[in-house]
């Protein structure tokens, strides 16, 4: 029967006794930077070309006897997971292997850099179709390794890496922390995060998604027909590299941003038991398990968005946190979150010719996060309209006044330390979808976009009594672009988007004291693109 | 994921550029920084990636590497250029004593220097 991991990544409509996805990734080349591999294994024979690249450190140990089969173990298994005949994800993909890890699975940042440079030079000398680079390795945070990954990604290469097996924040490791790389954590057959002894999968905001990574059957280097089960975030990354190869084979023109958005969009949502993660990391860690798209074509009509969390600002009074979108994504909204509730809101601002989302800590706060909503919106023209704090008691308001511009997100930022101690906030007048309204002490920022066929609407969910969480979701066919809270009172910790749902978090009910200021409204802005839908219909 | 400018959990040693008698001294006030792995056991002291500013050409990288070797030799230090990078990042990989870091950070075109460190199969 089909191994659990291949079943897990197969969309329900294709599930059968055999794993036979529609496209095997035949137009894509996958580079594997790992140990040496047994290229004559029946699973991968004729599919993997061993390059002459080798850059590895000496083995550790007072007595080291290397058996070829042991040296090849990790790389052979991963090559099998990506493209193996029987147990592989992308059975049609061709692979090239570079040896950057020694027989003990140890390498160096410098060896990995030289390997990445080798790939770039190969790409320049002999341009082929789409390239995927699988980096099933991790070391401590490295500025230079992240920079090299960024350069290679900007040259059109898709990099997929292991989040790391340290049961730790993936942002402390490289290349997992590189924003341009697709970083993959590991889950098991029960959709639990993978435990590896005392350790386990990494987590946090630097992880893009999870994939099967425990008890994965694949090629064993013990013999040319042997199979073995291995576990780790390398195995998870290999699944995503295989899925990416299949998506790129079906749509070779996909950019990295488009591929990442599709991987997120087609993932299984909210199936991971978050209790495994440390409490402070749960909100930052994506609850996504990778899966193949139900159809390899026809996803182009969708308006794709993802949520990007910043690093924590730190606790100093004037500390800020910045969340950025990828170069070919549009920042459609910006929100903020603080566990202590002490924050001074957020604003969208231009930095290096691109909008970023900046959140502001408040005096006595433990720090804030900025949360960017990053979307694929071709031919978009977006701008931020700001209204300074209002003199009148009615509150501050700002709207999209340019012809054809629609509201995609609202942010508010205030200089006073605690809005809750000032005049009571106003409620938003209804029936004005193109308008952001907020506290009179705050400046309000509206994200206004013009794009062919873009339409948006505001959806609200208010709760009169205090509650720790209020949510509002966009309906099928609409995509969440903006998420904010009304009113901006002191007990609101912040707002953020999880998939297509806007979440507004408030302080624990028992600590808020007075219930008079308890009303909280979650405001979602839901958009869709008729233009993309029409373009997709014309293609079909 | 990690901000590009968010040099996360690293030791950063910033040293002011000084003329040091160089013909091509860096602009006054610019600082090259030194980075190393926050996890001590994974550090590989003695091998360094010297990363040069973005638009540096291969010939300039090679010249900067040779200059480092010459200046190190004048101070009685042996160095070995293990690799010259081009195609992704301009720079070079050098085997040298950590005593030479201050000197290397003052070289023209240097953006930052990172001590080599280990990576592991996951």
């Amino acid at each position: 029967s089909i191994p659990w991991n291949l079943e897990r990544i197969t969309p329900p409509r294709y599930r059968a006794d055999e794993y036979q996805p529609p496209d095997g990734g035949s137009l894509v080349e996958v580079y594997l930077l790992d140990t040496s591999i047994q290229s004559d294994h029946r699973e991968i024979e004729g599919r993997v070309m061993v390059t002459d690249f080798e850059n590895v450190p000496e083995e550790d140990g007072t007595r080291f006897h290397s058996q070829a089969s042991k040296c090849d173990s990790h790389g052979t298994h991963l090559a099998g997971v990506v493209s193996g005949r029987d147990a592989g994800v992308a059975k049609g993909a061709s692979m090239r292997s570079l040896r950057v890890l020694n027989c003990q699975g140890k390498g160096t940042v410098s060896g990995t850099l030289i390997g990445l440079e080798f790939i770039r030079k190969s790409q320049l000398v002999q341009p082929v179709g789409p390239l995927v680079v699988l980096l099933p390795l991790a070391g401590g945070y490295s500025r230079v390794l992240n920079a090299a990954c960024q350069r290679l990604a900007r040259a059109g290469v898709v990099l997929v890496t292991a989040a790391g097996n340290f049961r730790d924040d993936a942002c402390l490791y490289s290349p997992a922390s590189a924003p341009e790389v697709i970083t993959v954590g590991a889950t098991n057959a029960q959709d639990q995060p993978v435990t590896l002894g005392t350790l386990g999968t990494n987590f946090g905001r630097c992880v893009d998604l999870f994939a099967p990574g425990e008890d994965i059957i694949g090629a064993s280097s013990d013999c040319s027909t042997c199979f073995v089960s291995q576990s780790g975030t390398s195995q998870a990354a290999a699944h995503v590299a295989g899925i990416a190869a299949m998506m790129l084979s079906a749509e070779p023109e996909l950019t990295l941003a488009e591929l990442r958005q599709r991987l997120i969009h087609f993932s299984a949502k909210d199936v991971i038991n978050e209790a495994w993660f440390p409490e402070d990391q749960r909100v930052l860690t994506p609850n996504l398990v990778a899966a193949l798209p139900p159809s390899t074509h026809g996803a182009g009509w969708q308006l794709f968005c993802r949520t990007v969390w910043s690093a924590h600002s730190g606790p100093t009074r004037m500390a800020t946190a910045v969340a950025r979108c990828a170069p070919d994504e549009e920042l459609l909204s910006c929100s903020s979150f603080s566990r202590s509730g002490k924050r001074r809101g957020e604003r969208m601002e231009a930095q290096g010719g691109k909008l970023v989302c900046r959140a502001h800590n408040a005096f006595g706060g433990e720090g804030v996060y900025a949360i960017a909503r990053c979307c694929l919106l071709p031919q978009a023209n977006c701008s931020v309209h700001t209204a300074p704090p209002a003199e009148a008691s009615m509150g501050t308001r700002v709207h999209c006044h340019q012809q054809g511009h629609v509201l995609t997100g609202c942010s508010s930022h205030w200089e006073v330390e605690d809005l809750g101690t000032h005049k009571p906030p106003v409620l938003r007048p209804r029936g004005q979808p193109n308008q952001c309204v907020g506290h009179r002490e705050a400046s309000i920022h509206a994200s206004c976009c013009h794009a062919p066929g873009l339409e948006c609407k505001v959806k609200e969910h208010g709760i009169p009594a205090p509650q720790e969480q209020v949510t509002v979701a966009c309906e099928e066919g609409w995509t969440l672009t903006g998420c904010s809270a009304l009113p901006g009172t002191s007990h609101v910790l912040g707002a953020y988007a999880v998939d297509n749902t806007c979440v507004v978090r408030s302080r624990d009910v028992s600590t808020t004291g007075s219930t008079s200021e308890g009303a909280v409204t979650a405001v979602a802005i839901c958009c869709r693109s008729r233009h993309l839908a029409q373009a997709s219909q014309e293609l079909q | 994921q990690e901000d590009e400018d968010g040099d996360y959990e690293e030791l950063v040693l910033a040293l002011r550029s000084e003329e040091d008698g160089l013909a091509e001294a860096p602009e006054h006030g610019t600082t090259a920084t030194f980075h190393r792995c926050a996890k001590d056991p994974w550090r590989l002291p003695g091998t360094y990636v010297v990363v040069l500013k973005e638009e540096t050409h291969l010939s300039q990288s090679e010249r900067t590497a040779r200059r480092l070797q010459a200046q190190a030799a004048r101070r009685g230090y042996l160095t070995k250029i293990l690799h010259v990078f081009h195609g992704l990042l301009p720079g070079f990989l050098v085997k040298m004593s950590g005593d030479l870091l201050e000197l290397a950070l003052k070289l023209p075109h240097v953006d930052y220097i990172e001590e080599d460190s280990s990576v592991f199969a996951q």
């Epitope: 007072t62 007595r63 080291f64 097996n165 002894g197 005392t198 350790l199 | 001590d40 056991p41």
Partner: antibody
Framework: QVQLVQSGAEVKKPGSSVKVSCKAS????????MHWVRQAPGQGLEWMGL????????YYADSAKGRFTISRDNSKNTLYLQMNSLRSDDTAVYYC???????????????WGQGTTVTVSS | QSALTQPPSVSGSPGQSVTISCTGT????????VSWYQQLPGTAPKLMIY???KRPSGVPDRFSGSKSGNTASLTISGLQTGDEADYYC???????????FGTGTRVTVLG
């Protein structure tokens, strides 16, 4: 649950040999390095040696070099400590312990056996 | 193998905090990860802290580790009677190519 079960107590004469075993259960034995540690009566912990997960690399304490050999049979999920030329000061409780994770954390011990008492006395 | 240096004993009343130091050299604590182990009377040691300051799941957050230079420390806050045990630090030593343990510290809970 995850455990290491060691063989029973041994009483040996000086100059003789003994082989202590440690059987692993409920974890993938061949993914973990393994240590031996001993504790003489009323004394502290003394590390004896470490064997790589696949048996390909090893380290020994000076006091174990030449006389003690660590081996493993991954098909039986079992680790062994062969002790030759026993001396009275080898009298101790011998613990096997699992190395935490792969090569990057081989040196912390996260699961311990219950201990095997080896008494060397004439 | 020369051991890392720990105080033979420390004591405190229930609810108090105690700190155990572990001093080594640049070839062990200074440049290697440090672990801490608890050994209750008559039992095998148990890992409490690894990589200076990380706790395996199941270890209470009353136990915390830190490192400065060639010295590592284990702090037990909110001391409980069940914490009475011997505590050992441990670190790889790159010059010996071997693991070294501390001399051990007995923690006594008064009263």
């Amino acid at each position: 649950q995850v455990q290491l079960v060691q063989s029973g107590a041994e009483v040996k004469k000086p100059g003789s040999s003994v082989k202590v075993s440690c059987k692993a259960s409920a974890f993938t034995f061949d993914s973990f390095g393994m240590h031996w540690v001993r504790q003489a009566p009323g004394q502290g912990l003394e590390w004896m040696g470490l064997l790589w997960s696949d048996g390909s690399g090893e380290y020994y304490a000076d006091s174990a070099k030449g006389r003690f050999t660590i081996s493993r049979d991954n098909s039986k999920n079992t680790l062994y400590l062969q002790m030759n030329s026993l001396r009275s000061d080898d009298t101790a409780v011998y613990y096997c312990a699992r190395a935490m994770g792969a090569i990057y954390y081989y040196y912390a011990m996260d699961v311990w056996g219950q201990g095997t008492t080896v008494t060397v006395s004439s | 193998q020369s051991a890392l240096t720990q105080p033979p004993s420390v004591s405190g009343s229930p609810g108090q905090s105690v700190t155990i130091s572990c001093t080594g050299t640049s070839s062990n604590i200074g440049n290697q990860f440090v672990s801490w182990y608890q050994q209750l009377p008559g039992t095998a040691p148990k890992l409490m802290i690894y990589e200076y300051n990380k706790r395996p799941s199941g270890v209470p957050d009353r136990f915390s580790g830190s490192k400065s230079g060639n010295t590592a420390s284990l702090t037990i806050s909110g001391l409980q009677t069940g914490d009475e045990a011997d505590y050992y630090c441990g670190s790889w030593d790159s010059s010996l190519s071997g693991y070294v343990f501390g001399t051990g510290t007995r923690v006594t809970v008064l009263g």
